[in-house]
Interface confidence: low
């Protein structure tokens, strides 16, 4: 059951001091902003008991798990039904408190009645201020039954409800005819969905035998323990002044739980705290009585004494509810009342026992809800106890329920039931949501609805490029925070999946469904401009460009150069794949062509603005290469070149160009024009002695033609260093074109 308690402070001398507090012991209760836990709600329910309107009540939240209602100005504000709602999802639970006016004509002998299906319920309204009129009984605000005023028995009006069924549950009231509804006696009837001691669909399962006034929940078989008791079967008393499923809450004020009414989830209802009784929970239990409403009797044996909060306190050598068990009888020690495991895990469960004779391994066994008995695989024997360890086979959902550890020796036997909750690891029902995207990152909300059980302890986000077979990248994130996936590729689809885990071994759920998230690719905004270009041949063009300087990283992957040949209607595109490049050599162009040239930055598949265009005219293609080039040294500074004219000339040659280079030298070559195109020999002068030279030549008509073969020749020795090579008869106007 959900750990939810509604406390009413019944010190009623001053309504302004009256308050209601709802306390949740659930993990993450009331966090509201957290997607895993809705907030606690505490309100007056005016649907059945309507009171005159007054100033609004004040709601104050104290931390994440407590909410208090104050601001009652007059006694009539208090009369009626109040409810607290807490817990998440399927565990969302409503706890109800019914408040009666102490000055009413009729008062309930007992406000909350919890009965089993098929039982007879008897509601008893005690006459407080007599009126000689009929009494009207109502159920959930609707007329139900009338009793004549003289039908009172022993100053009480009784309503008998035979063979009650769950739909009979609700708020009942007894009111004198024509009296104010605020003077009514209000009751709450809770009808369990099963007969006594049974629970579950079809009521086929047996309740664990709740102790100390605990009530077996008809849906899950758990004991809803009275305030001040804990354990699977409510077998353990809390310290005085404590309440909550684990005794974790403390009653406020110096007088402990005096004057407080405690309301718990159905089918428990409401009662005083342990050790107190009376309509305002201000009377201590009479000797020999203990527990909530002092309903329990101690009946202590063997010298035990009765404590009104916890029951029998046994002398040494004895234990048990009534101190009826000798310590010679074996006893299960410190068994947790509730254990939680994840589905399909194989946990180890320990069970410790003491006694005389001492329990050994074979004397301790573990029984599952289906009756299967497990024997321990190992035992640790210590001076004061034996701890048996059980290896549990792979858990299935049907293993949820009450398990039992049993010890048997010749001194007797003991058993302890405990609840095992098998939890289903959470599986996302939806894919994560994309919040924002950039070219290299995605911001994702990992919060999704899920099947299975919470709470969610970790969220893993798995991602990899779409259609990739590479390993998934994984990031572990906080369930409540958005996640940024970084260092991604621009304009790339990523498959993204969520994996949820709950606490404990084997708490990782299956991966959720994938979703496709695509990184962005911002459009490049910078416009380059062409710095310059020069022709490196009839079909080669070197181009250079610049970009404006802007702060921040450059948004771009490279440049696209476009050459438009308007005559032929053709476009040539050249991709420069480095965004740092500022120059490119374009080859394989058509000689003699007029091109329009521009450059633009690109990012992924997006193009930025093009530069202002440039117009470039490539020279036409030249004649074929001269044939049979030959070199012959004439002296230490002269070499003669001879050749034959090219064949199939498209027109008259305007000149020849000779290229001279020192063999193995690192310097640039020299170009010398031969302006008499009819000649087939020339002498290159001004060379260095004993030096090896390389020569080649080409003809020019409108444009330069193809190079001839390269020839080698060395000058003769013993000469002086020359100033540089010149052509035979034109040394004064040699044409050097570098």
């Amino acid at each position: 059951a959900v750990d939810l308690t509604l406390l009413a402070n019944l010190r009623l001398t001053d309504p302004q001091r009256f308050f209601l507090t709802c306390v949740s012991g659930e993990a993450g209760a009331g966090r509201g902003s957290d997607a895993w836990g809705p907030p606690l709600l505490l309100e007056k329910d005016d649907r059945i008991v309507r009171t005159p309107p007054g100033p609004p009540l004040r709601l104050a939240r104290n931390g994440s798990h407590q909410v208090t209602l104050r601001g009652f100005s007059k006694p009539s504000d208090l009369v009626g039904v109040f409810s607290c709602v807490g817990g998440a999802g399927a565990r969302r639970t409503r706890v109800i408190y019914v408040h009666n006016s102490p000055g009413a004509h009729l008062l309930p002998d007992k406000v909350t009645h919890t009965v089993n299906k098929g039982d007879t319920a008897v509601l008893s309204a005690r006459v407080h201020k007599e009126k000689q009129t009929d009494v009207i009984w109502k159920s959930n605000g609707s007329y139900f039954y009338t009793l004549d005023w003289h039908e009172a028995q022993d100053g009480r009006f009784l309503l008998q409800l035979p063979n009650v069924q769950p739909p009979s549950s609700g708020i009942y009231s007894a009111t004198y005819l024509e009296a104010s509804p605020l003077g009514s006696a209000f009751f709450r009837l809770i009808v369990r969905g099963c007969g006594a001691g049974r629970w579950g669909p079809g009521c086929t399962k047996e309740c664990p035998g709740c102790l100390h006034g605990g009530v077996c929940h008809d849906h899950d078989g758990e004991c809803v323990c009275p305030p001040g008791f804990t354990g699977t079967r409510c077998e353990q008393a809390c310290r005085e002044g404590r309440f909550g499923q684990s005794c974790q809450e403390q009653c406020p004020g110096i007088s402990g739980c005096r004057g407080l009414t405690f309301c718990l989830p159905d089918p428990y209802g409401c009662s005083c705290g342990s050790g107190w009784r009376g309509s305002q929970c201000q009377e201590a239990c009479a000797p020999g009585h203990f527990g909530a409403d002092c309903r329990l009797q101690c009946q202590c044996q063997n010298g035990g004494t009765c404590d009104r909060f916890s029951g029998c306190v046994c002398p040494s050598g004895w234990h048990g509810v009534h101190c009826e068990k000798s310590d010679r009888i074996p006893q299960i020690l410190n068994m947790a009342s509730e254990l939680e495991f994840n589905l399909e895990t194989m946990p180890r469960i320990n069970c410790a026992a003491a006694g005389n004779p001492f329990p050994v391994r074979g004397s301790i066994e573990l029984r599952k809800p289906d009756g299967t008995v497990l024997l321990s695989t190992k035992a640790i024997v210590e001076p004061e106890k034996t701890t048996a360890e059980f290896e549990v086979p792979r858990l299935v959902l049907a293993d949820s329920g009450f398990w039992e550890c049993r010890v048997s020796t010749s001194g007797g036997q003991d058993s302890r039931r405990f609840k095992v909750n098998v939890k289903v690891p959470p599986v996302p029902l939806a894919a994560p949501r994309l919040l924002t995207k950039q070219s290299r990152q995605l911001v994702v909300s990992p919060l999704v609805s899920f099947s299975g059980d919470g709470p969610i302890s970790t969220v893993r986000l798995h991602y990899r490029p779409q259609d990739s077979t590479m390993d998934w990248s994984t990031i572990v994130v906080d369930p409540s925070e958005n996640v940024t996936l970084m260092n991604l590729r621009p304009k790339t689809g990523y498959s993204v999946r969520v994996q949820l885990s709950r606490p404990g071994e084997g708490g990782e759920g299956a991966w959720g469904p994938p979703t496709l998230m695509t990184t962005d690719c911002p459009e490049p905004l910078l416009q380059p401009w062409l710095e310059g270009w020069h022709v490196e041949g009839t079909d080669r063009l070197r181009v250079s460009w610049s970009l404006p300087l802007v702060p921040g990283p450059l948004v771009g992957d490279g440049f696209l150069l476009r050459l438009w040949d308007g005559t032929r209607g053709q476009e040539r595109r050249e991709n420069v794949s480095s965004p740092q490049a500022r120059t490119a050599l374009l080859t394989g162009l058509t000689p003699g062509t007029h091109y329009q040239l521009d450059v633009q930055l690109y990012h992924c598949t997006l193009l930025g603005p093009a530069s202002p265009p440039a117009h470039v005219l490539l020279p036409p293609s030249g004649p074929p290469a001269p044939r049979h080039l030959h070199a012959q040294a004439l002296s230490d500074s002269e070499i003669q070149l001879t050749w034959k004219h090219p064949e199939a000339l498209p027109g008259p040659i305007s000149k020849y160009v000779v290229e001279v280079q020192v063999a193995g030298g690192a310097g640039d070559p020299l170009w010398i024009d031969v302006d008499r195109p009819e000649e087939t020999s020339t002498i290159i002068r001004g060379l260095n002695a004993s030096t090896r030279y390389l020569f080649r030549m080409r003809a020019s008509i409108q444009g330069l033609g193809d190079w001839s073969n390269t020839v080698e020749e060395s000058t003769l020795g013993n000469g002086l260093q020359a100033e540089g090579p010149v052509q035979e008869s034109r040394a004064a106007e040699e044409g050097l074109d570098q």
Partner: antibody, heavy 119, light 107 residues
């Protein structure tokens, strides 16, 4: 191609049993919530049962609760429906269907298999 | 359990007509509703989920609207291939009940 293919239908006598199978292909079966839906001849659609990815969580329509069992074998990419104590009113075409990840809507359906309960 | 009621149970229409089918839920289901199309001898086909979101590959002439307890499927220009039976289904927790269907026939 994403596909679901049911099999195992046929004629059975009242009180008898039948096991339907649904073979999944073209998607990661172990990540999806799966359902059985049926349609009596000439009638509308009736949801029968659901099973969550790990196989640990199931739910049934009241009309089949206690008689039908849904299960799955993720290693075989197969969904099952074990039908016991069959009645004449169970006669229908049985479809298996996949649930969209972000809603409970059924986005992929099999072609269906006919179950006839008659003496 | 949530009951789903569809209206009309059948209707006759011509190609090009605008057709509206209404579905009511017995309690508030916010926008947890789907629409399916089924042709004889074939399995149903998902058209719309979350009351108004078109399933991928479904023509844009199909649209859904509504929230709470009343929902509408509209076909804004009936095509020959649209003559079929249409079902609504609530998605607001189990059991996921369907409406009884609306048969759209050729006039």
């Amino acid at each position: 191609e994403v596909q679901l293919l049911e099999s195992g239908g046929g004629l059975v006598q009242p009180g008898g049993s039948l096991r339907l199978s649904c073979a999944a292909s073209g998607f990661t079966f172990s990540n999806y919530v799966m359902q059985w839906v049926r349609q009596a001849p000439g009638k509308g659609l009736e949801w029968v049962s659901v099973i969550y990815p790990s196989g640990g969580m199931t739910n049934y329509a009241d009309s089949v609760k206690g008689r039908f069992t849904i299960s799955r074998d993720n290693s075989k990419n197969t969904l099952y429906l074990q039908m016991n104590s069959l009645r004449a009113e169970d006669t229908a075409t049985y479809y298996c269907a996949r649930i969209r990840g972000d809603t409970r809507a059924f986005d992929i359906w099999g072609q269906g298999t006919m179950v006839t309960v008659s003496s | 359990d949530i009951q789903m009621t569809q209206s009309p149970s059948s209707l006759s229409a011509s190609v090009g007509d605008r057709v509206t089918i209404t579905c009511w839920a017995s309690q508030d289901i916010r926008t947890s509703l789907a629409w399916y199309q089924q042709k004889p001898g074939k399995p149903p086909k998902l058209l719309i989920f979350a009351a108004s979101t078109l399933q991928g590959g479904v023509p844009s002439r199909f649209s859904g609207s509504g929230s709470g307890t009343e929902f509408t499927l509209t076909i804004s220009g009936l095509q020959p291939e649209d003559f079929a039976t249409y079902y609504c289904q609530h998605l607001n927790g189990y059991p996921l009940t369907f409406g009884d269907g609306t048969k759209v026939e050729i006039r």
